[in-house]
């Protein structure tokens, strides 16, 4: 990796694009801290591990983030 | 439709300063990481320096270290680029461009967007 | 600090042939980092690729990209007569945080 977490912040660019969670690999939501001062949301695809950073004021973005707590919360007994 | 159009170069002596601007159009300007990029006079083309989308993380050429900032103001859609201390070498086209979407700092997109370019003379 | 090698410096073909433009990194380089651009006389840069071998949107399928570690190739299967152009590998790395190559200029054989 080029640059380490020292950088603050992750996102260069974030995509308002919904995601399919059934390509989604994995869904980081980084909380604000003192390397960052916004959420970070960083979704990695199954096609070729693409890592994407999406908006977290976007819409689809909130509508992807309650469809995966809800399959989540399917699968957790 | 998507644009960015660069302005402000001109010629200008060694030592003295200028500063460049870039006006995004058609597109969300405050959620893209923006780059500036240069190209010399029949020369291949060398990056500048970076910026993301909240203006959190900038990143500079060593050949600009110190010399150059770049900044943004997304409320009026526009990327700059202060340069001072300029030598006969950073004469060249400047363009400015868009970083794609979603990048990061683990997957990069590409620069998917350019300006036209504008020039920048250094000559006493 | 990552030098990128492009060659041929040039490559001389004629419509309809293929075209393999080559760029070779001094250290390895993820592909999740390496792009490639076109540039025309007068022209700004245009992304063709990124991660690669993803195509960049609108770009034809004619274009593609391929490898990985050191050894990255830019192929065009059938040269357009708009295709003739300059070719530029990026990477992006430390120090510089991105990397241009040399460029291969693809002309008219």
């Known amino acids: 990796i080029p640059l380490s977490r020292t950088v603050r912040c992750t996102c260069i660019s974030i995509s308002n694009q919904p995601v399919n969670p059934r390509s989604l690999e994995k869904l980081e939501i980084i909380p604000p801290s003192q390397f960052c001062p916004h959420v970070e949301i960083i979704a990695t695809m199954k096609k070729k591990g693409e890592k994407r950073c999406l908006n977290p004021e976007s819409k689809a973005i909130k509508n992807l983030l309650k469809a995966v707590s809800k399959e989540r919360s399917k699968r957790s007994p | 439709q998507v644009q960015l159009v660069e302005s402000g170069g001109g010629v200008v002596q060694p030592g003295r300063s200028l500063r460049l601007s870039c006006t995004a159009s058609?597109?969300?300007?405050?959620?893209?990481?923006m780059h500036w990029v240069r190209q010399a006079p029949g020369k291949g083309l060398e990056w500048v320096a970076v910026?993301?989308?909240?203006?959190?993380?900038?990143y500079y050429a060593d050949s600009v270290k110190g010399r150059f900032t770049i900044s943004r103001d997304n409320s009026k859609n526009t990327l700059y680029l202060q340069m001072n201390s300029l030598r006969a070498e950073d004469t060249a086209v400047y363009y400015c461009?868009?970083?794609?979407?979603?990048?990061?700092?683990?997957?990069?997109?590409?620069?998917?967007?350019w300006g036209q370019g504008t020039t920048v003379t250094v000559s006493s | 600090e990552i030098v990128l090698t492009q060659s041929p410096g040039t490559l001389s073909l004629s419509p309809g042939e293929r075209a393999t433009l080559s760029c070779r990194a001094s250290?390895?380089?993820?592909?999740?980092?390496l792009a490639w651009y076109q540039q025309k006389p007068g022209q700004a840069p245009r992304l063709l690729i990124y991660?690669?071998?993803s195509r960049a949107t609108g770009i034809p399928d004619r274009f593609s990209g391929s490898g990985s570690g050191t050894d990255f190739t830019l192929t065009i299967s059938r040269l357009e007569p708009e295709d003739f152009a300059v070719y530029y590998c990026?990477?992006?790395?430390?120090?510089?945080?991105?990397?241009f190559g040399p460029g291969t200029k693809v002309d008219i054989k």
């Open positions: 461009a868009r970083e794609g979407e979603g990048s990061n700092i683990y997957y990069y997109y590409g620069m998917d967007v």
């Open positions: 910026i993301s989308y909240g203006g959190d993380i900038k």
């Open positions: 991660g690669a071998s």
């Open positions: 990026q990477q992006y790395g430390s120090s510089p945080i991105f990397t």
């Open positions: 058609g597109f969300t300007f405050s959620q893209y990481g």
């Open positions: 250290q390895s380089v993820s592909s999740s980092y």
